[in-house]
């Protein structure tokens, strides 16, 4: 398991315009866990990173992920309700130069090494769908969310807004 060194453990405003022409409005270093309090961990295996969903032992340190938050304008012609709206998008980086990516063909979530500007597959629309939990919707595939399947992260299609509170797409962010 690994974390990110040298990043402040609180949110900070940034002045960095290098990512797709927009700067993150803030960044936040946090551990990611499921609704049922299993930890999301990252391990280097055979020169590639694997993502696991597991119960940690009592004093085992949680892996941290750097979440970068971006504000995105959503044009009224896409929003369907005739008004321009704003939404929050995030990228998630568990270690330097690696970001979570949505692989829509394989319905999988993968860690890819890439340079900025990041591809759209690395961006997720942030949802607060349940008290103090968040969900991550693929920018490239609306209605598809990061979720938990067989102790791994996977992409899960959510058919209706009533299913947005389903536990397997809910995550908790914690600084500890």
């Amino acid at each position: 398991a690994f974390g990110i060194s040298g990043v402040q453990k609180y949110t900070r405003a940034l002045h960095d315009s290098s990512i797709t022409g927009i700067s993150p409005i803030t960044e936040y270093l946090a551990s990611l866990s499921t609704y049922n309090d299993q930890s999301i961990t990252f391990a280097l295996e055979d020169e590639s990173y694997e993502i696991y969903v597991e119960d940690l032992k009592k004093d085992e340190k949680k892996d941290k992920v750097l979440l970068s938050y971006y504000e995105s304008q959503h044009p009224s012609n896409e929003s369907g309700d005739g008004v321009d709206g704003k939404m929050l998008m995030v990228t998630l980086s568990p270690t330097k130069d690696f970001w979570l990516h949505a692989n829509n063909k394989e319905h999988s979530v993968e860690l890819h090494k890439c340079e900025k500007p990041l591809p759209d597959q690395a961006f997720f629309v942030l949802h607060n769908m349940h008290s103090n939990c968040v969900s991550f919707e693929c920018k490239t595939d609306p209605g598809v969310f990061i979720g938990v399947k067989d102790n791994h992260l996977a992409l899960i299609k959510v058919d209706s807004s009533e299913n947005l509170c389903t536990e397997n797409i809910l995550f908790k962010l914690s600084e500890t």
Partner: antibody, heavy 121, light 106 residues
């Protein structure tokens, strides 16, 4: 154009219940959360609760047992119901909309004009 | 629940001056803090969100700073319409609590 408008009973007797309707237009309740906030005359703001875009609710811990929030999406209405009213529930009640789609992190740009509810015998 | 402690409760200032209001959160809230202005008999107006972002149409004499647990809000070059009440609110976690407010007096 985004609008929220509260309509309430004005006067409620102690121990009775309060129902306020928030009529919204210019946006979809499936995309934005709607919150209820109240302000006792001459005092500060109290957050009461939220109905999130996905349908889940969150409430003020101290008032949770007396509050419920629901919606009728087909009529673009959000409802606040509060039971067992006391005189110190006298306040202006506001409904407000999230700034961001799907998320409350951005605060509240759009507010209703508020409806004054007086609890008195 | 997260407690928000806003200070001062009231402050006197003159036209053209600058004032600063602070808000302390009882636990870390990242950058998820908003500042509102409220004129008497009116609904509050969002001025700053995400701790530092100016809401649409808000003059640049308003600014916000801070992260974690300590936040501040500054008004430069005070105008007559600024002598009203101001509130902070944390939006990191439900319940989304407000500070007690600051009344700005001339």
């Amino acid at each position: 154009q985004v609008q929220l408008k509260e309509s309430g009973p004005g006067l409620v007797a102690p121990s009775h219940s309060l129902s306020i309707t928030c009529n919204v237009s210019g946006f979809s309740l499936s995309k934005y959360g709607v919150h209820w906030i109240r302000q006792i005359p001459g005092r500060g703001l109290d957050w009461l609760g939220v109905l999130r875009a996905g349908g889940s609710t969150g409430y003020n811990s101290a008032l949770m047992s007396r509050l419920s929030i629901s919606k009728d999406s087909s009529k673009s209405q959000v409802f606040l119901k509060m039971n067992d009213l006391r005189t110190d529930d006298t306040a202006v009640y506001f409904c407000v909309r999230d700034h961001y789609y799907y998320s409350s992190y951005g605060g509240f740009v759009y507010w209703g004009q508020g409806t004054l509810v007086t609890v008195s015998a | 629940d997260i407690q928000m402690t806003q200070s001062p409760a009231s402050q006197s200032a003159s036209l053209g001056e600058s004032v600063t209001i602070t808000c302390l959160a009882s636990q870390t809230i990242g950058a998820w803090l908003a500042w509102y202005r409220q004129q008497p008999g009116k609904s509050p107006q969002l001025l700053i969100y995400a701790a530092t972002r100016l809401a649409d149409g808000v003059p640049s004499r308003f600014s916000g700073s801070g992260s974690g647990t300590e936040f501040s809000f500054k008004i430069n070059n005070l105008q007559a319409e600024d002598f009203v009440s101001y509130y902070c609110q944390q939006l990191d976690s439900s319940p989304y609590t407000f500070g007690g407010g600051t009344r700005l007096e001339m």
